[in-house]
């Protein structure tokens, strides 16, 4: 069976890393486990990993935004940032604003790698399933 | 044969959903049909679906922009928005501006699903083949 | 073996096309050659090609930004732009700013095609491996 995941935004995320909807809606989870915000790899190989985050706010103050996909493995002492997007000076002060960040690339992942998504400012994330998501598939 | 499509912008289109060039240039269409703006799935399975839209204008007024990939199937009464990008407050008032929206993710699609792309303002889309496109491939 | 590449930003790039790190870090290069900034295809077929570029500056002057993935083949007299992103009027004058451009799509590539990435303003690119990259894989 194809190893694949597509998880969507979960609005009751209160901490980092982001948590994801893994059951309802347009979610996919096959041959990969989901655990506390992370996708857990159980077969070493090449994977295309992607994520989109939708940021928005009522009144722009140009707070710097970052969106990271990172990897954690008990064998390594430190998280590895695989992909990252940053935004600064992206809207007009005081205005209602909205912006997305998209990341996607190929990585060689190892069994027991845990993949997570982090953002700099949780309160500015909108968690609609079509707008904020995290996924991968094994090539 | 691999089921794959890569369609590019078609500039004389006035209708929603967007219409696409399916014949000339860097277009691909194999094992998938194109019909009135839509990619028609003829084999159930997992697909990576993507789209990019290039918005631009002569004089910025920060018109809210949206870019959606959605699915329609005669079995279901309503369109399903699979992926969406929104932009608000993205340029400096009065200036010439340009911005892209990119979407891409994995979905479980069913034979007879029709996939389309919608934008909030057609007048602000530039249809160059390298800038605005819509595609998918079966995993 | 799967034909795949993921190259990351190389900060000593001084000219176009961009040059890439092809050895250290989260780099992948298998069944594809890297030569003077280009990925060289050695087997005709369908490929998903992607790139992300992270632009940033100390003081915004809204210099138009472009990010292109293009193809060169000795059989053809001219480069073919496969994907392109442009940005104009994207930050507030005088402010520190940061923005990414992401491109990704499927193409039918031929043995001996050379793929490159070009940007309009090299001095505004940040080459962190998680932020600026270029890759592909054969479907």
């Amino acid at each position: 069976l194809r190893k694949v995941a597509h998880l969507t935004g979960k609005s009751n995320s209160r901490s980092m890393p982001l948590e994801w909807e893994d059951t309802y809606g347009i979610v996919l989870l096959s041959g990969v486990k989901y655990k506390k915000g992370g996708l857990v790899i159980n077969e070493t190989g090449l994977y295309f990993v992607y994520s989109k985050v939708y940021f928005r706010g009522q009144s722009c103050n140009n707070l710097p935004l970052s969106h990271k996909v990172y990897m954690r493995n008990s064998k390594y002492p430190q998280d590895l940032v695989m992909m990252e997007g940053k935004m600064m000076s992206y809207c007009t002060t005081g205005q209602m604003w909205a912006r997305s960040s998209y990341l996607g690339a190929v990585f060689n992942l190892t069994s027991a790698d845990h993949l997570y998504v982090n953002v700099s400012e949780l309160s500015l994330v909108n968690f609609e399933e079509s707008q904020t998501f995290f996924g991968l598939y094994k090539l | 044969l691999r089921k794959v499509a890569h369609l590019t912008g078609k500039s004389n289109s006035r209708s929603m959903p967007l219409e696409w060039e399916d014949t000339y240039g860097i277009v691909l269409l194999s094992g998938v049909k194109y019909k009135k703006g839509g990619l028609v799935i003829n084999e159930t399975g997992l697909y990576f679906v993507y789209s990019k839209v290039y918005f631009r204008g002569q004089s910025c007024n920060n018109l809210p922009l949206s870019h959606k990939v959605y699915m329609r199937n005669s079995k279901y009464p309503q369109d399903l928005v699979m992926m969406e990008g929104k932009m608000m407050s993205y340029c400096t008032t009065g200036q010439m501006w340009a911005r892209s929206s990119y979407l891409g993710a994995v979905f479980n699609l069913t034979s007879a699903d029709h996939l389309y792309v919608n934008v909030s303002e057609l007048s602000l889309v530039n249809f160059e083949e390298s800038q605005t496109f819509f595609g998918l491939y079966k995993l | 073996l799967r034909k795949v590449a993921h190259l990351t930003g190389k900060s000593n790039s001084r000219s176009m096309p961009l040059e890439w790190e092809d050895t250290y870090g989260i780099v992948l290069l298998s069944g594809v050659k890297y030569k003077k900034g280009g990925l060289v295809i050695n087997e005709t077929g369908l490929y998903f090609v992607y790139s992300k570029v992270y632009f940033r500056g100390q003081s915004c002057n809204n210099l138009p930004l472009s990010h292109k993935v293009y193809m060169r083949n000795s059989k053809y007299p001219q480069d073919l732009v496969m994907m392109e992103g442009k940005m104009m009027s994207y930050c507030t004058t005088g402010q520190m700013w940061a923005r990414s451009s992401y491109l990704g799509a499927v193409f039918n590539l031929t043995s001996a095609d050379h793929l490159y990435v070009n940007v309009s303003e090299l001095s505004l690119v940040n080459f962190e491996e998680s932020q600026t990259f270029f890759g592909l894989y054969k479907l």
Epitope: - | R14, M16, P64, S120, E121, L122, S123, L124 | -
Partner: antibody, heavy 119, light 111 residues
Framework: QVQLVQSGAEVKKPGSSVKVSCKAS????????ISWVRQAPGQGLEWMGW????????QYNENFKGRVTITADKSTSTAYMELSSLRSEDTAVYFC????????????WGQGTLVTVSS | EIVMTQSPATLSVSPGERATLSCRAS??????????IHWYQQKPGQPPRLLIY???HLESGIPARFSGSGSGTEFTLTISSLQSEDFAVYYC?????????FGQGTKVEIK
């Protein structure tokens, strides 16, 4: 900058036709609709129809019962509105306006052309 | 067709005061994304000028004292502090479907 320049005032007899022109500049003519809106003396605004110069498609307000025809010439970036079977109640100022396709708000207007229908 | 009804027909306001103009649609002009209502100002002998689009978005070059609100069938144009140049006729227009229709207008005059 965007400009829409209309042809001059016309005086017409009842039963005749009038053709008003609207020359666009400062933007890509084929990417926006051109709408026509009229305003009778001391009255409000009435939308007559639009044309999309990109492919020549058009839509009309049924209140005009086939009397209105809107055309466009891409080579000169000019739109035209022809109103036939004129009657006295067609006396009005006729405006062309650039319209965004999807949002359909009128963001730039011509200066207006007064058409007087009188015997 | 959708009928747009504006009220009041005439509004007498002193310079510096706030003006609130209403527009009601005979059926909803909103979708999940946007409310397809636009506001224009017209002065004698001039074409209309776009002020607010999609119910609440200020057109480029329009002073911030103009604002719009509402959804569904009820919409409001507010001028926070009337200036002498604001005395004019104001029209709402919908673009939810064909035909596009305008309200009959509200004349804002000096009190």
């Amino acid at each position: 900058q965007v400009q829409l320049v209309q042809s001059g005032a016309e005086v017409k007899k009842p039963g005749s036709s009038v053709k008003v022109s609207c020359k666009a500049s400062g933007y890509t003519f084929t990417r926006f609709d051109i709408s026509w809106v009229r305003q009778a003396p001391g009255q409000g605004l009435e939308w007559m129809g639009w044309i999309f110069p990109g492919d020549g498609s058009s839509q009309y307000n049924e209140n005009f019962k086939g009397r209105v025809t809107i055309t466009a010439d891409k080579s000169t970036s000019t739109a035209y509105m022809e109103l036939s079977s004129l009657r006295s109640e067609d006396t009005a100022v006729y405006f062309c306006a650039r319209s965004l396709i999807s949002t359909a708000m009128f963001d730039h207007w011509g200066q207006g052309t007064l058409v007087t229908v009188s015997s | 067709e959708i009928v747009m009804t504006q009220s009041p027909a005439t509004l007498s306001v002193s310079p510096g005061e706030r003006a609130t103009l209403s527009c009601r649609a005979s059926k909803s002009v909103s979708t999940s994304d946007f409310s397809y209502i636009h506001w224009y100002q017209q002065k004698p002998g001039q074409p209309p000028r776009l002020l607010i689009y999609l119910a609440s978005h200020l057109e480029s070059g329009i002073p911030a004292r103009f604002s719009g609100s509402g959804s569904g069938t009820e919409f409001t144009l507010t001028i926070s502090s009337l200036q002498s140049e604001d005395f004019a006729v104001y029209y709402c227009q919908h673009s939810r479907e064909l035909p596009r229709t305008f309200g009959q207008g509200t004349k804002v005059e000096i009190k």
